[in-house]
């Protein structure tokens, strides 16, 4: 069965920085989406070889692509706090095939220590494949930010 390998699982970046998300498949797909999970999932980009990429207005001018639809690296630039969230690659074959998700934590410079990625993949990756008729894994399971440690208040 077709799979989507997605990396990284999680990345913490300061405001204004860039992040790379790579979506790799074994081929045989028609195109690939990057979608942001949440209570109201957003479609970020659609990429298909030989076709001008389609980009959400919010990210226009902030996204670059390298590679091909089978092995695509998406670079998001000038990240804002509101870009924090879980991003999932979705490959179009005869059915929708999902990547494991990338948790992007965009932080203020001084709060870098509060929210750091663990080695574990985002919780969205533990979900079974969504049933037919379901657009995305349940967004409620893919929380954007972990709770800060209890002693995270500034002195």
């Amino acid at each position: 069965a077709q799979e989507v390998q997605q990396s990284p699982h999680c990345t913490t970046v300061p405001v204004g920085a860039s992040v790379n998300i790579t979506c790799s498949t074994s081929g045989g797909l028609r195109g690939i989406y990057l979608r942001q999970l949440g209570p109201q999932p957003q479609d970020i980009i659609y990429y298909e070889d030989g076709v001008v990429p389609t980009t959400d207005r919010r990210f226009r001018g902030r996204i670059d692509f390298s590679g091909s639809q089978d092995n695509l690296t998406i670079t998001m630039h000038r990240l804002q706090l509101s870009d924090t969230g879980t991003y999932t690659c979705q490959a179009i074959t005869e059915v929708n095939v999902y990547g494991s998700g990338t948790l992007v934590l965009v932080t203020e410079e001084q709060s870098q220590g509060w929210h750091r990625c663990s080695d574990a993949p985002p919780r969205a990756s533990a979900l079974p494949a969504p049933p037919t008729g379901s657009a995305l894994p349940d967004p409620q399971t893919a929380s954007a930010l972990p709770d800060p440690p209890a002693a995270s208040a500034l002195p």
Partner: nanobody
């Protein structure tokens, strides 16, 4: 199973506007990429516009770009096609289509469900 019903077609003069609607039955409307196609008399079916699940991605054929706008209201299970500056060559039957595993390009790949169409006639 999804059923699609187009409305809003009619006769309009060149330069005029129309707004087509496509109402979908079923609770999983937001699980579908939606597209509009058209077929002029004696011609093949042609892609017009497409919109992604959330509505944040849209695509258009070169022939309608800047004149037509596709949008959707997931709460109302409806997709729209606002057509401005209509030309006689826009005369066709307009169909909406829905697909769960569909691209944003100008093909009908993955479009599982189709409406019966609504006639748009643009007179000069």
């Amino acid at each position: 199973q999804v059923q699609l019903q187009e409305s809003g077609g009619g006769l309009v003069q060149a330069g005029g506007s129309l707004r087509l609607s496509c109402a979908a039955s079923g609770r999983t409307f937001s699980s579908y990429v939606m597209k509009w196609f058209r077929q002029a008399p004696g011609k093949g079916r042609e892609f017009v516009a497409g919109i992604s699940w959330s509505g944040s991605l849209t695509s258009y054929s070169d022939s309608v770009k800047g004149r037509f706008t596709i949008s959707r209201d997931n709460a109302k299970n409806t997709v729209y096609l606002q057509m401005n500056s209509l030309k006689p060559e826009d005369t066709a039957v307009y169909y909406c289509a829905a697909g769960e595993a569909a691209t944003m390009s100008d093909t009908d790949y993955g479009m599982d469900y189709w409406g019966k169409g609504t006639q748009v006639t643009v007179s000069s």
